[in-house]
């Protein structure tokens, strides 16, 4: 019941968190800031990873996306593919972890094929959530080391005077998103890789044999001392011994699955 | 690079009228707030008047009712309808605009044109 539970809620924990890594990602307030040398009107100004918009205080907004790919900053794109593939693998992995949960029977599909799928799904939440967790982190160094309060002033070759306006540049709400969200992802792709543990029957294959020696004269079969794992060739625990030695499967009438060392 | 080239600069007697016009080209993203400047020989640099990208407008009390701006977003084109010029509205008008580039539109610049000159004079 308890690893049904935690699967569960390791289920609900993700689909929030991947829905959180989609929103961040689409959202526009990666970055915010206000345009202070504006003698007119507050000019607001938010941006996304996928466009760039102006708000004034009279109303007026606009939006404009990003059309190029080659001329963008590198860290942009870089930002842009680790939330691509945090969505990515954590759609797979709820894909996945909907025919593992336990409370869904499929057919006739084993505990063992659950527990793969389980792992499996949780381990896809786990670097989905580390991915989205990355991507805001890198675009938040972004803004803290490249542009916090831009005041630097150049001057172009044409002779026109070239300043970067007196910006000041705070965390948009995606940022807060993206990391609550990759945070929800990586803990319910750990509590899917703890249930994963509950739902694998640990199954022995070791079977206990018992020797009887029948007096002195015990003759062993040349090259016959040979060791079953339960994994190999020797899985029906063959005679491997002539004399006294017999199996628990001879001895008794019905072997019980469940023959324990 | 971006370019801000100002035209319809010239001489001018008091009372006449003059359309100034700056065009911003090159790898722009986004133009925000455009303005005129101007100064004067021997005087510091003076604003006239701004324009937001929607269409807020801010002017000098010295050119209040006489000067009107107003701008292009689609060609990127700002505009000075200067009525009623006084011997006192000489000076070099320069333009500029607060953009962002296609290649960081993460960060907003104040580009400025070479300036234009007016000379109202009889």
């Known amino acids: 019941m308890a690893v049904t539970a935690c699967q569960g809620l390791g289920f609900v924990v993700s689909l929030i968190g991947i829905a959180g890594i989609i929103a961040a990602t689409c959202m526009d307030q990666w970055s915010t800031q206000d345009l202070y040398n504006n003698p007119v009107t507050a000019v607001f100004n938010y941006q996304g990873l996928w466009r760039s918009c102006v708000r004034e205080s009279s109303g007026f907004t606009e939006c404009r996306g990003y059309f190029t790919l080659l001329g963008l900053p590198a860290m942009l794109q870089a930002v842009r593919a680790l939330m691509i593939v945090g969505i990515v693998l954590g759609a797979i992995g709820l894909l996945v972890s909907i025919f593992a949960l336990k409370c869904i029977r499929i057919g006739s599909m084993e505990d063992s094929a659950k527990a793969n799928m389980t792992l499996t799904s949780g381990i896809m939440f786990i670097v989905s959530g580390l991915c989205a967790i990355a991507g805001v982190s890198v675009f938040a160094n972004m803004l803290v080391t490249n542009f916090w309060m831009s005041t630097a002033n150049m001057y172009t070759g044409m002779g026109g005077m070239v300043q970067t306006v007196q910006t000041r540049y705070t965390f948009g709400a995606a940022l807060f998103v993206g990391w609550v969200a990759g945070g929800l992802t990586l803990i319910g792709g750990v509590m899917m890789c703890i249930a994963c543990r509950g739902l694998a029957p640990e199954e022995t294959n070791y079977k206990a044999v018992s020797y009887h020696a029948s007096g002195h004269s015990v003759a062993y079969k040349p090259g016959g001392f040979k060791a079953s794992t339960g994994f190999g060739s020797n899985t029906k625990n063959k005679k491997i011994y002539d004399g006294g030695a017999r199996t628990e499967d001879e001895v008794q009438s019905y072997p019980s699955k469940h023959d324990y060392v | 690079q971006v370019q801000l080239v100002e035209s319809g600069g010239g001489l001018v007697q008091p009372g006449g009228s003059l359309r100034l016009s700056c065009a911003a080209s090159g790898s722009i993203f986004l133009i925000n707030a455009m303005g005129w400047y101007r100064q004067a020989p021997g005087k510091g640099l003076e604003l006239v008047a701004v324009?937001?990208?929607?269409?807020?407008?801010n002017y000098a009390d010295s050119v209040k009712g006489r000067f009107t701006i107003s701008r292009d977003n689609s060609k990127n084109t700002l505009y000075l309808q200067m009525n009623s010029l006084r011997a006192e509205d000489t000076a070099v008008y320069y333009c500029?605009?607060?953009?962002?580039?296609?290649?960081?539109?993460?960060?907003?610049?104040?580009?400025w044109g070479q300036g234009t000159l007016v000379t109202v004079s009889s």
């Open positions: 500029n605009a607060d953009l962002n580039l296609r290649s960081d539109p993460f960060k907003w610049y104040t580009f």
């Open positions: 324009i937001t990208r929607g269409g807020s407008a």
